[in-house]
């Protein structure tokens, strides 16, 4: 049938060929493919100043396939669109346009913002942070001994970074002054700062409880956990004193 289509067209176009190259049902030397075999898509290919018809199994970038009964063609996406699913649904916009719900826009609609990496209109994302972690031990110059007045810090994590138009993140660390009972540094004690230091029962005179200085930077409301910690630390102090008195009496 394809050959007959080629033969019949020979009357209309003296240069129509019967032996068409890949995919063409009918063709001519001047125009290339005139029509395509079933399921293939016709597209005009620009070769220099000339346009030649070719038949492809799928459409090139910037085109989408349109199927009509026994005739398929590659149809151009809209002018502002690089890749599309059909005439009304773009999947990638040309430079300078933002994709939103299959359309290419100069500017994103109200309530959305442009993502310049994906070139899409996206929801505005606000910063999200975790709860504060507990206050660090009271330190001074990186040491936890040999001083009375120091500072303590607490941190929180950024759970969600904001997008360009989103609310900025609040501070993620907070420092305040603290007062402790002075404790002599033991030989070789490095008194490492923060969480690197091994947690152990406080020595005599060391209070795990930070006593905020009256000039403290920022104090926050005490959580139930923090209250619980303070009570535990008070109990430990009392136990420490009792143990000390017992050991002293045995020495004598």
């Amino acid at each position: 049938q394809n050959a007959s289509r080629g033969r019949r067209q020979r009357r209309m176009h003296p240069n129509v060929s019967q032996g068409c190259q890949g995919g063409c049902a009918t063709c001519s030397d001047y125009n290339g493919c005139l029509s395509c075999k079933p399921r293939l898509f016709f597209v005009l290919e620009r070769i220099g100043m000339k346009q030649i018809g070719v038949c492809l199994s799928s459409c090139p970038s910037g085109y989408y396939g349109t199927r009509y009964p026994d005739i398929n063609k590659c149809t151009k996406c809209k002018a502002d669109c690089d890749t599309c699913f059909n005439k009304n649904f773009c999947t990638k916009c040309k430079s300078g346009f933002y994709l939103h719900l299959g359309k290419c826009l100069d500017n994103c609609p109200e309530g959305l913002e442009a993502n310049n990496h994906t070139m899409e209109c996206v929801n505005i994302v606000h910063c999200e942070v975790s709860e504060w972690n507990p206050w660090s031990p009271c330190t001074k110059k990186g040491k936890t001994c040999g001083f009375k007045r120091g500072t303590e810090t607490r941190v929180r994590e950024i759970m969600q970074h904001p997008s360009a138009k989103g609310n900025l993140c609040p501070p993620t660390n907070e420092t305040r002054k603290c007062t402790v009972q002075r404790k002599k540094c033991q030989k070789g004690e490095r008194g490492k700062k923060g969480r690197e230091r091994k947690r152990k029962k406080p020595n005599k005179g060391e209070s795990k409880e930070a006593i905020p200085d009256s000039k403290g930077l920022e104090s926050s409301k005490e959580t139930p956990e923090q209250r619980e910690n303070k009570q535990q630390q008070k109990k430990r102090k009392v136990q420490d004193k009792q143990q000390k008195s017992v050991s002293v009496s045995t020495v004598h």
């Epitope: 007959s4 289509r5 067209q9 005139l34 005009l44």
Partner: antibody
Framework: EVQLQESGPSLVKPSQTLSLTCSVT????????WNWIRKFPGNKFEYMGY???????YQNPSLKSRISITRDTSKNQYHLQLNSVTTEDTATYYC?????????????WGQGTLVTVSA | DIVLTQSPSSMYASLGERVTITCKAS??????LSWFQQKPGKSPKTLIY???RLVDGVPSRFSGSGSGQDYSLTISSLEYEDMGIYYC?????????FGAGTKLEIK
């Protein structure tokens, strides 16, 4: 040379069915695409649809519920039926052919037949 | 559907004159544009297809150009037999649509 010739009644009553035939010589309707086009009195053209070499059809959605395109390969003819006609369907009806996107579109036309819809 | 706006709707021109008729599509039709001529009482005759390709047997004074949404038909030197109505037709997608026509008359 491919030739197309329309035939059918020139007068149809409103609400009736308009039936036209296009007889083709010089080519077989089992190749190419065979179309119906009409031209209204004010010189405005409207594309109606086609029947392909395999017998598949396309109808203009504006007419879809009323139009039917069929063929008779033994007679090398194809037909147009338009149901529930009104005076708005008064037009010159043409059959025409094309062979694919890369060739001349409507390379051959029939001479046209004027159909008047009137009581 | 794609709308084709043809201009002018009618014109007078002298023999030997260069004549240009334009056709603007409501969207990019990717060169799938044809021009045809119709004379009173005659069937239409296709002149040009795929924007600029002349149908066999059509005089070379006829030429077509354009791309995207804008297309034109030019008659380089008008002859008496060129009077008639000229239409543009797009076939980028179905349904195909036609321009409203340009009536060309001799001055």
């Amino acid at each position: 040379e491919v030739q197309l010739q329309e035939s059918g009644p020139s007068l149809v009553k409103p609400s009736q069915t308009l039936s036209l035939t296009c007889s083709v010589t010089g080519d077989s309707i089992t190749s190419g695409y065979w179309n119906w086009i009409r031209k209204f009195p004010g010189n405005k053209f409207e594309y109606m649809g086609y029947i392909s070499y395999s017998g598949k059809t396309y109808q203009n959605p504006s007419l879809k519920s009323r139009i039917s395109i069929t063929r008779d390969t033994s007679k090398n003819q194809y037909h147009l039926q338009l149901n529930s006609v009104t005076t708005e369907d008064t037009a010159t009806y043409y059959c025409a052919t094309y062979y694919g996107y890369g060739g001349p579109w409507f390379a051959y036309w029939g001479q046209g037949t004027l159909v008047t819809v009137s009581a | 559907d794609i709308v084709l706006t043809q201009s002018p709707s009618s014109m007078y021109a002298s023999l030997g004159e260069r004549v240009t008729i334009t056709c603007k599509a409501s969207q990019d039709i990717d060169s799938y544009l044809s021009w045809f001529q119709q004379k009173p009482g005659k069937s239409p005759k296709t002149l040009i297809y795929l924007t600029n390709r002349l149908v066999d047997g059509v005089p070379s004074r006829f030429s077509g150009s354009g791309s995207g949404q804008d297309y034109s038909l030019t008659i380089s030197s008008l002859e008496y037999e060129d009077m008639g109505i000229y239409y543009c037709l797009h076939y980028d997608e179905f349904p195909l649509t036609f321009g409203a026509g340009t009536k060309l008359e001799i001055k």
